[in-house]
Interface confidence: medium
């Protein structure tokens, strides 16, 4: 029962992570530039995202513009876009794999096969979490680097946008949820670890470990 509870918790976390990731990727709030300081009356705020940028005037009016051409975009932005989409698709794939191996489904009958699928889905979710983390950390690094660059005009110094925080949250949830799924899978059936060793010798190293044998730092 504890195993089932952890599985459900893991999936709920990954689902929350996926939704956070989707919102993070979609929102144009990766970089925020507040045009204050050098012209105090012109309190314009620029939000930049992966797909569009928005200008919020001091009057409260907001204008958004979708980026024109894919090829004209900077390479780091193109890479961030690609990684974001791949991460979301990978997480969706992980969900499908989990559903196939979930205790409450009949897609797969054998308990040990179900356990393997749950483990696989956990690994896929962890990969998705890492893929989500890369563009978020890269963008944050660029913002911080520019912030401390004396040549960058003060008015153009950006701040970390809400999307980055959502991205970190998404990555954390995917890693945590995936980690929980990886931890629950060895107790997938009544058979002990030796049973797995006998029946699935080729994949034994991946699924014969008890939860205590996994280095916990991988799932933090």
């Amino acid at each position: 029962m504890a195993s089932a509870g952890m599985q459900i918790l893991g999936v709920v976390l990954t689902l929350l992570g996926w939704v956070n990731g989707l919102v993070s990727c979609a929102l144009p709030m990766w970089k925020v530039t507040a045009f204050i300081g050098n012209s105090i009356v012109v309190a314009q705020v620029v939000w930049e995202g992966l797909w569009m940028s928005c200008v919020v005037q001091s009057t409260g009016q907001m204008q958004c513009k979708v980026y024109d051409s894919l090829l004209a975009l900077p390479q780091d932005l193109q890479a961030a876009r690609a990684l974001c989409v791949i991460a979301l698709l990978v997480a969706l794939f992980g969900l499908l794999v989990y559903l196939a191996g979930a205790k409450c489904t009949t897609c797969v009958e054998e308990k040990d096969s179900k356990a393997r699928l749950v483990l696989t889905s956990g690994i896929v979710f962890v990969i998705s979490g890492v893929l989500t983390l890369i563009p978020v950390c890269w963008t944050a690094h660029a913002i911080i680097r520019d912030f401390y660059n004396p040549l960058v005009a003060e008015a153009q110094k950006r701040e970390l946008g809400a999307s980055l925080y959502l991205g970190w949250a998404a990555s954390g949830l995917l890693l945590l949820g995936g980690g929980l799924l990886c931890c629950t899978c060895p107790s997938g059936g009544s058979q002990g670890p030796s049973h797995y060793m006998a029946r699935y010798s080729t994949s034994a190293p991946a699924i014969s470990r008890g939860p205590s044998e996994y280095p916990t730092k991988n799932y933090v």
């Epitope: 050098n38 012209s39 009356v41 012109v42 930049e48 008015a155 153009q156």
Partner: antibody, heavy 118, light 107 residues
Framework: QVQLVESGGGVVQPGRSLRLSCTAS????????MHWVRQAPGKGLEWVSF????????NYADSVKGRFTISRDNSKNMLYLRMDSLRAEDTAVYYC???????????WGQGTLVTVSS | AIQLTQSPSSLSASVGDRVTITCRAS??????LAWYQQKPEKAPKSLIY???SLQSGVPSRFSGSGSGTDFTLTISSLQPEDFATYYC?????????FGQGTKLEII
């Protein structure tokens, strides 16, 4: 309406000094950063200097750093450019321009000609 | 300093033509690029800011695009009053820099 009027230009010998003024009207001068931009005869535009709305920060082009000083008097709606150790290559029309934040140089003056010649 | 290279440096066109001027930055300047129009013996006039936003009062036949290092100014249908010199300018890094200008002449 927004108006910027430069004055103080003229002919000056190399090594001497000159002070340009820019009178602003039609907007709350103390709320806006201000720039000086110059244009040598028959040449392109060159940004010279920028001063924040409250005079707390300034920036200069490398070609004038240490020789030119930008300042302002918000009570008089005036922007100044003090030019020392003038060189022949400083000969240009000098424009003052308002910093509109995101819109950068949104309003310009008509310019004042500075000729550095012996 | 960031170098801005405009091309072409001069351009001949007729009224009604569609014209495109490009501006390339020596390194990424995000979207912090403006375009100006200057007529002989006159002060420059702001056309486009933040790469693609039209300055208020500027006709909609003017448009800007680009991000990073490559930018374009497009005039969809040239009018007689559009014949002038056009400059791009970056305001991401100090010192702020201008392109060398593109002179648009009438055929």
């Amino acid at each position: 309406q927004v108006q910027l009027v430069e004055s103080g230009g003229g002919v000056v010998q190399p090594g001497r000094s000159l002070r340009l003024s820019c009178t602003a009207s039609g907007f709350t001068f103390s709320h806006y950063g201000m720039h000086w931009v110059r244009q040598a005869p028959g040449k392109g535009l060159e940004w010279v200097s920028f001063l924040w709305f409250d005079g707390s920060k300034d920036n200069y082009a490398d070609s004038v750093k240490g020789r030119f000083t930008i300042s302002r008097d918000n009570s008089k709606n005036m922007l100044y450019l003090r030019m020392d150790s003038l060189r022949a290559e400083d000969t240009a029309v000098y424009y003052c321009a308002r910093n509109g934040g995101l819109t950068i140089f949104d309003y310009w003056g008509q310019g004042t000609l500075v000729t550095v010649s012996s | 300093a960031i170098q801005l290279t405009q091309s072409p440096s001069s351009l001949s066109a007729s009224v009604g033509d569609r014209v495109t001027i490009t501006c390339r930055a020596s390194q990424g300047i995000n979207s912090w690029l403006a375009w100006y129009q200057q007529k002989p013996e006159k002060a420059p006039k702001s056309l486009i800011y933040a790469a693609s936003s039209l300055q208020s009062g500027v006709p909609s036949r003017f448009s800007g695009s680009g991000s990073g290092t490559d930018f374009t100014l497009t005039i969809s249908s040239l009018q007689p009053e559009d014949f002038a010199t056009y400059y791009c300018q970056q305001y991401n890094f100090y010192p702020y820099t201008f392109g060398q200008g593109t002179k648009l002449e009438i055929i």
